[in-house]
Interface confidence: low
């Protein structure tokens, strides 16, 4: 398993599949999008990223979805952080939360290959999709709930879709939202967000002894 020494005092060593969903709309300027990426990279520094512990995916969404990192990518954590830091700014007119949740449901979590791990989608949203695109929004959120995927919306700035955020929160008690006035607040909320995610994930069970090594005590 490819792992690296921890870079911070707080280090999340849990069983977790975490998907970062980045709003690629022009509601964020290119400089603001850089800060959003810095936040993602910073979060990744605080996770024990490996195929055994925390697996991560990074998706930028606009009218479609563009995956930069998949859960099964076997790369060093530093390389994954480098890839995340190079996500391209789309600056598109539309960023469809419905489309990216559909993508998360049917592409990323189509097969649950780690039932023992928690599944979380961190939805970083700064815009509102057009009404016509949001027809199946609730259906996708419910689909994710059925697959035990926790959706944590992070609303950023004045144009974040608060109605959708509230709908996500209503679906499950774990779907806790963070609403921030700008990207600059991400760094102040970083520790709270990462510890909340980490608390939702189980610790690895203690290693079980192979059958032939089981200890027998005779009374």
């Amino acid at each position: 398993d490819i792992s690296e020494p921890p870079l911070h005092d707080f280090y999340c060593s849990r069983l977790l599949d975490l998907v970062f969903l980045l709003d690629g709309s022009s509601r964020l300027s290119e400089a603001e999008f850089e800060v959003l990426k810095a936040f993602v990279v910073d979060m990744m520094e605080r996770l024990r990223i490996s195929q055994k512990w925390v697996r991560v995916a990074v998706v930028e969404y606009h009218d479609g979805s563009h995956a930069y990192i998949g859960l099964k990518d076997r790369k060093r954590p530093s390389e994954l952080r480098r890839i995340a830091s190079q996500v391209k700014y789309a600056g598109s007119q539309v960023a469809s939360t419905s489309e990216v949740l559909k993508y998360t449901l049917f592409q990323i979590f189509s097969k649950i290959d780690r039932p023992e791990a928690s599944r979380i989608a961190l939805l970083l949203m700064a815009s509102q999709e057009p009404q016509r695109m949001s027809r199946n929004f609730v259906r996708y959120v419910q689909g994710l709930k059925k697959k035990k995927v926790i959706v944590i919306p992070v609303g950023i700035g004045p144009h974040a879709n608060l109605k959708q955020i509230r709908l996500i929160e209503k679906q499950a008690p774990e779907n806790k939202a963070f609403v921030l006035s700008s990207v600059d607040e991400l760094e102040q909320q970083r520790d709270e967000i990462v510890s909340y995610l980490c608390d939702l994930a189980p610790e690895a069970p203690p290693p079980t002894l192979p059958p032939h090594m089981a200890q027998v005590t005779v009374g």
Partner: nanobody, 123 residues
């Protein structure tokens, strides 16, 4: 690419104040978190303070209250104001920059480093 140049070091008495400056070159200064580290002879480099582009600050617990970090994005400058200096503050002080916008407290997370400026505090 970011080049960093520290200045302002020198020899002072215990209890004195000193302000270190770090001048940066490069167009992207306003996107980088900046940090100050120090290294005393025979010791490891240790974190002092850091500041993000939006002026969010972090300090080493032992230095809180005595040291203040600030920056001017337009002038591409970072300062470390040190008050109530003690002999144990004697060290080479280094300015560092991260590629990202978030502060960090460990040296390996910084991508660019200055040459350092010496601070000597005598009792």
């Amino acid at each position: 690419q970011v080049q960093l140049q520290e200045s302002g070091g020198g020899s002072v008495q215990a209890g004195d104040s000193l302000t270190l400056s770090c001048a940066a070159s490069g167009r992207t200064f306003s996107m980088h978190a900046m940090g100050w580290f120090r290294q005393a002879p025979g010791k490891e480099r240790e974190f002092v303070a850091a500041i993000s582009p939006s002026a969010f600050t972090e300090y080493a617990d032992s230095l809180k209250g005595r040291f203040t970090v600030s920056r001017d994005n337009a002038k591409k400058l970072v300062w470390l104001q040190m008050n109530g200096l003690k002999p144990e503050d004697t060290a080479a002080y280094y300015c560092a920059a991260r590629r990202g916008a978030f502060t960090a407290t460990t040296a390996p997370l910084y991508d660019y480093w200055g040459q350092g400026t010496q601070v000597t505090v005598s009792s």
